[in-house]
Interface confidence: low
């Protein structure tokens, strides 16, 4: 469980796994929390010790039993890691330390008027980890108002000295306050050059990216996939840095994936944990415990509850199972990552969720912010489930929209594939706002499988629904995450706040829009809709939306995209843009495939393809 108490005048004896200098016990505790093996820490404030070398010493400790003997030491502060402490887990540290000089590599000096401005400069500099500021009363006039930006190999000061009229602090990048902004894109088949600061094994590029984000010196990474040509390098995640802060070169390289640390992201950072479970994969490491449990999720929960457990493998080998329970191998390593990753096994592996700060990672997205004809421009992250389905033949163009409903699944309209069922011609772009931002270097997803509803017929409007299985799972970010699906046969909910989004035409004879458009449209009853479309059958598996006077509607190019409605603070995918008579015509509402009516089909297809449902469902 979560232990938050601090022990004054106490020092844990033994169990040392790392030591560093930190300005106070809280920062020491944070470093312990993020260290893969640290369970306990002891901190020596300047006042507690005469030995200059040990002043501000932060000692990170591990213990098989979860505790260590405490010895009395005046002024010392000891405590526990905040692993398992949910929302209290944060790498953000805002404090300013007066009368303290945190030493490191001084790589930038400038004159500023306040310590806050110095901290802001550090936060807006990609390499700055901490800073020192000489106040106006500093004893040497030429150094007054100097703001020194610093870094060190471990991200913590190389020494801390008591010095009058100096104030120090840390970058607020871990607080998601950087103005730099971050690169969310993952670059398939691209390897970055430059300095490797660390090497770990990870099951995918997204775990690699999260590790990079929380590594003090990682600015970008290259991940070598499990089909990389050199066996000994498979699943290697190389954490990298460079003097410029960006890769000095990149090389097209099959089966490599590169990307950037997300530490400079504004507003939100990824959680410092990895919630995904990897079927058919074994994680090797030091054995902590073996227990019989029922199911891989219980195995993950068991690992999460056992504080020293870092990752696990749930074995489905017949000899490892009895009755309904199978062996759950709880493991750890020096760096928190598996020491070996094996594929094609009868196990499923994953990580402890002890550093997750939201607790439940499977909840639906509940973001509250809110051409389409009559629409307005959307903003970044407003509709993070919206994808653009593009076809690349001689040229490339946007054809349809779609909705991300799982790591590896997109829901769209069947008619988008009329005449183009070839999986290799499609490119799926997620996490984008402007189509003009797409270049030849923009990463995209390729299709592993197109599943068109078995009853769909090209010439008819019925069953206009299709699932796309992506070749590789997508990571969730602020700009790329799934929309919740409705409950099966959801008919009782009255939706009053519904929106349609897409890059489609802004008028009937228009053109594809650059910026993702949004329009707020009311739902129309099927009876009312049937009156407007007397030549067509509006079935219970369709839903209509539109204004009586027209003027706002989905249009060509919006097909397959989402009709989402917000209910009880949660967005749900109510419809898939399907068809209509023209666009935004008076008394001609848009017709959408009713997702709730296809929940059985969606679950059947995603489960049979995967053996496991991966949808975002409010249940």
């Amino acid at each position: 469980g979560c232990l938050t108490q601090l022990y004054e005048n106490a020092f844990f004896r033994g169990g040392d796994v790392a030591s560093m200098y930190t300005p106070n016990a809280q920062y020491c505790q944070m470093r312990c929390t993020f260290h893969p093996r640290c369970l306990l820490f002891s901190f020596l404030p300047a006042s507690s010790i005469n030995d200059m070398e040990k002043r501000f010493g932060c000692f990170l400790k591990d213990s098989v039993t979860g505790t260590l003997p405490k010895v009395h030491r005046t002024g010392a502060v000891s405590g526990h890691s905040l692993k398992q402490c949910g929302h209290q887990i944060s790498a953000c540290h805002r404090d300013i330390y007066k009368g303290v000089d945190m030493r490191g590599v001084n790589f930038n000096v400038s004159k500023v008027s306040s310590v806050e401005e110095c901290q802001k400069r550090c936060t807006s500099n990609i390499r700055c980890q901490f800073f020192s500021y000489a106040t106006q009363t500093f004893h040497k006039a030429e150094y007054r108002n100097n703001c020194l930006l610093k870094y060190s190999p471990g991200g913590t000061p190389t020494a801390i000295k008591v010095l009058s009229n100096v104030e120090s602090g840390f970058s607020l990048k871990p607080c998601a306050l950087s103005e730099i902004g971050c690169h969310m894109n993952i670059f398939q088949h691209l390897a970055f050059s430059d300095v490797d600061v660390a090497r770990v094994l990870t099951p995918d590029a997204f775990v690699c990216r999260t590790i990079c984000t929380y590594h003090p010196n990682c600015l970008f990474f290259t991940f070598y996939t499990n089909v990389w040509k050199i066996e000994s390098q498979r699943n290697v995640c190389l954490l990298k840095t460079s003097e410029s802060g960006t890769p000095s070169s990149s090389t097209p390289q099959e089966n490599t994936i590169s990307g950037y640390s997300l530490l400079t992201c504004k507003r939100t950072l990824p959680e410092p944990c990895h919630s995904k479970i990897y079927p058919g994969v074994d994680f090797g490491g030091e054995e902590l415990n073996v227990t019989f449990v029922k199911g891989v999720n219980v195995c993950q929960e068991t690992c999460t509850k056992m504080i020293r457990c870092q990752f696990f493998t749930y074995s489905l080998l017949p000899e490892d199972c009895k009755e309904e329970k199978c062996k759950c191998f709880l493991r750890l390593s020096m760096d928190g990552s598996p020491t070996r990753i094996a594929y094609g096994t009868q196990g499923s592996s994953g990580y402890s969720l002890r550093l997750c700060n939201t607790g439940d990672n499977s909840v639906c997205t509940t973001k509250t912010s809110t051409r389409i004809v009559g629409g307005t421009n959307s903003s970044w992250g407003e509709w993070p489930w919206q994808v653009s389905l593009q076809v690349k033949l001689t040229a490339q163009r946007h054809l349809c929209g779609g909705s991300l409903i799982g790591h590896q699944w997109v829901l769209t309209a069947a008619h988008c594939f009329d005449g183009l069922p070839l999986q290799d011609v499609w490119r799926i772009y997620s996490g984008i706002l402007n189509l003009s931002d797409i270049t030849k270097d923009t990463p995209f997803s390729q299709i592993k499988e197109i599943i068109i509803h078995q009853n769909y017929k090209v010439s008819e409007g019925n069953h206009d629904i299709a699932l796309i299985k992506l070749q590789a799972p997508l990571n969730y970010t602020e700009f790329q995450k799934p929309i919740c699906l409705p409950s099966k046969g959801d008919t009782s909910t009255i939706y009053t706040n519904c929106w349609v989004t897409g890059w489609g035409f802004s008028k009937e004879k228009g053109e594809i829009q650059n910026i993702l458009q949004k329009v707020n449209i009311p739902l129309v009853t099927n009876e009312e809709c049937q009156k407007r479309y007397q030549d067509y059958k509006i079935t219970q598996r369709m839903v209509c939306a539109g204004y009586k006077e027209g003027g706002k509607d989905a249009c060509k190019g919006d097909s397959g995209g989402p009709l989402v409605c917000k209910h009880n603070g949660m967005w749900r995918l109510v419809g898939i843009t399907s068809w209509g008579e023209g666009c935004a015509r008076r008394e001609q509402p848009g017709v959408y495939t009713k997702v709730a009516e296809y929940m059985d089909w969606i679950l059947e297809k995603t489960q049979s393809s995967d053996g496991k449902a991966q949808m975002q469902s409010p249940a």
Partner: antibody
Framework: EVQLLESGGGLVQPGGSLRLSCAAS????????MLWVRQAPGKGLEWVSS????????MYADSVKGRFTISRDNSKNTLYLQMNSLRAEDTAVYYC????????????WGQGTLVTVSS | DIQMTQSPSSLSASVGDRVTITCRAS??????LNWYQQKPGKAPKLLIY???SLQSGVPSRFSGSGSGTDFTLTISSLQPEDFATYYC?????????FGGGTKVEIK
């Protein structure tokens, strides 16, 4: 200008040891994968060992595994090859070389240092 | 290990001749093939990387082609300074391996 200068070669008896050094200049040494390639008299080129920029990731040819150790000191811009349990068949000119990114093309080579293993 | 077989092992040619050297890999290596030139007593020099990309500073009379298992180095018009030994090298998988070399001599 990129320069790689090997040193440490010489005559050694079978079973003996030798440490080769390669001083690098003209580029940011710490950014590059480095390797050793050897060439026996009158023969072709044979890759010996590679080391990634951080020094934590090394690879060896089967013929030298367990006997040779590649290392680097990024602060000194120097690459090393510690050769133990030397055999007659290790006699060769040893080249230090720089690898350009993931394509593993060797874009710069040193002039080579001769190692002779003989009794 | 991937074996790289060069042919011919040696050839005689005159200045101005068009010279072709082939390199065959024991398994597909996509385009992960590099060509080097080595003169007696000197270190090798990179000519071509990724099967067909000309290294900076290398004369345009050198060209490379091929993909998969069969590759070719072509010297369109042999110059006196081109008499040397040429090696191919695969960088598809560990260990990186070199061809046995092709010695280009004056006829």
């Amino acid at each position: 200008e990129v320069q790689l200068l090997e040193s440490g070669g010489g005559l050694v008896q079978p079973g003996g040891s030798l440490r080769l050094s390669c001083a690098a200049s003209g580029f940011t040494f710490s950014y590059y994968t480095m390797l050793w390639v050897r060439q026996a008299p009158g023969k072709g080129l044979e890759w010996v060992s590679s080391i990634y920029p951080s020094g934590g990731f090394t690879m060896y040819a089967d013929s030298v595994k367990g006997r040779f150790t590649i290392s680097r000191d990024n602060s000194k811009n120097t690459l090393y090859l510690q050769m133990n349990s030397l055999r007659a068949e290790d006699t060769a000119v040893y080249y230090c070389a720089r690898v350009d990114t993931a394509m593993a093309m060797i874009d710069y080579w040193g002039q080579g240092t001769l190692v002779t293993v003989s009794s | 290990d991937i074996q790289m077989t060069q042919s011919p092992s040696s050839l005689s040619a005159s200045v101005g001749d068009r010279v072709t050297i082939t390199c065959r890999a024991s398994q597909s290596i996509s385009s992960y093939l590099n060509w080097y030139q080595q003169k007696p007593g000197k270190a090798p020099k990179l000519l071509i990387y990724a099967a067909s990309s000309l290294q900076s500073g290398v004369p345009s009379r050198f060209s490379g082609s091929g993909s998969g298992t069969d590759f070719t180095l072509t010297i369109s018009s042999l110059q006196p300074e081109d008499f040397a030994t040429y090696y191919c090298q695969q960088s598809y998988s560990t260990p990186i391996t070199f061809g046995g070399g092709t010695k280009v001599e004056i006829k």
